[in-house]
């Protein structure tokens, strides 16, 4: 029967945990991405930010997973959900911030 959407969110969280735990050299060679507001439209915004990082196999699965939480197609250079583009941070910090927020949503039962 139907499953709680929490299982999909848990998979995404586990992937982000894997990235942060397995990180040895600077993640994605220290690439910088736009920081995002962790509010409504967060998944699309996160994808739009990360999609601009190319050649970084460590986050390819994360990029792909995020597409399942965003209703529209996201391409590099697209910023329809990234309302604020004033600060760039390293991918490693971006992943940590996103992970902390998703864990908070998971604990609060906010799965969508």
């Amino acid at each position: 029967g139907p499953v709680p959407p929490s299982t999909a969110l848990r998979e995404l969280i586990e992937e982000l945990v894997n990235i942060t735990q397995n990180q040895k050299a600077p993640l994605c060679n220290g690439s910088m991405v736009w920081s995002i507001n962790l509010t409504a439209g967060m998944y699309c915004a996160a994808l739009e930010s990360l999609i601009n990082v190319s050649g970084c196999s460590a986050i390819e699965k994360t990029q792909r997973m995020l597409s399942g939480f965003c209703p529209h197609k996201v391409s590099a250079g697209q910023f329809s959900s990234l309302h604020v583009r004033d600060t760039k941070i390293e991918v490693a910090q971006f992943v940590k911030d996103l992970l902390l927020h998703l864990k908070k949503l998971f604990r609060e039962g906010q799965f969508n």
Partner: antibody, heavy 123, light 106 residues
Framework: EVQLLESGGGLVQPGGSLRLSCAAS????????GSWVRQAPGKGLEWVSA????????YYADSVKGRFTISRDNSKNTLYLQMNSLRAEDTAVYYC????????????????WGQGTTVTVSS | SYELTQPPSVSVSPGQTASITCSGD??????SFWFQQKPGQSPVLVIY???KRPSGIPERFSGSNSGDTATLTISGTQAMDEADYYC?????????FGTGTKVTVL
């Protein structure tokens, strides 16, 4: 290793029923959507049905709507396809597919395919 | 209903480039996916999100998608690439597969 194993295919008369099963191993199937895709002899791929991992929504091709029912038993990590009122044109190899993650699973891509089970509808 | 059209066949010499097109109304607005199927085997995902390769897929496979056409390109085609190829997209709550293209390596 991620694997999908289909079973339940066979020979059935027109108007008859069959229930296909797809047992998943190596991952938590309930986190992902699951689909059935079929391929008639010598023909191309045709999507049949999907079961969303987020909320359990179901989707069907027009050709099977009202005759086929997709379901899943999360405790058994198994996806099912109940096929009723079978027709000759339903004859095909039926593949079980690990589909995407999240409410918009279709954006992810059909990663893992089973080996297929053959359904033959003939009198 | 939504349709994806592919050429029935493409022939290519070993080492040369094979291009397979997939046409559909505003296909560029959707994610496109490509599958390879060899005789007697299950399909394998070779391209997702228009141009990305799953792990294990050789670099000679590449994809693009804009306007009404998605394209799968096989550079330096090898004998082992001889297979049927299908594009796929999602439209109006249904998956749609392309008509399929048989790639023959001469």
């Amino acid at each position: 290793e991620v694997q999908l194993l289909e079973s339940g295919g066979g020979l059935v008369q027109p108007g008859g029923s069959l229930r296909l099963s797809c047992a998943a191993s190596g991952f938590t199937f309930s986190s992902y959507a699951g689909s059935w895709v079929r391929q008639a002899p010598g023909k191309g791929l045709e999507w049949v049905s999907a079961f969303s991992g987020s909320g359990g929504s179901t989707y069907y091709a027009d050709s099977v709507k009202g005759r086929f029912t997709i379901s899943r038993d999360n405790s058994k990590n198994t996806l099912y396809l109940q096929m009723n009122s079978l027709r000759a044109e339903d004859t095909a190899v039926y593949y079980c597919v690990q589909d995407g993650l999240g409410p918009y699973f279709y954006n992810y891509g059909m990663d893992v395919w089973g080996q297929g089970t053959t359904v033959t509808v003939s009198s | 209903s939504y349709e994806l059209t592919q050429p029935p066949s493409v022939s290519v010499s070993p080492g040369q480039t094979a291009s397979i097109t997939c046409s559909g109304d505003k296909l560029g607005d959707k994610y496109s996916f490509w599958f390879q199927q060899k005789p007697g085997q299950s399909p394998v995902l070779v391209i997702y999100h228009d141009s990305k390769r799953p792990s294990g897929i050789p670099e000679r496979f590449s994809g693009s998608n804009s306007g009404d056409t998605a394209t799968l390109t096989i550079s330096g085609t090898q004998a082992m690439d001889e297979a049927d190829y299908y594009c796929q997209a999602w439209d109006s709550s249904t998956y749609v597969f392309g008509t399929g293209t048989k790639v023959t390596v001469l």
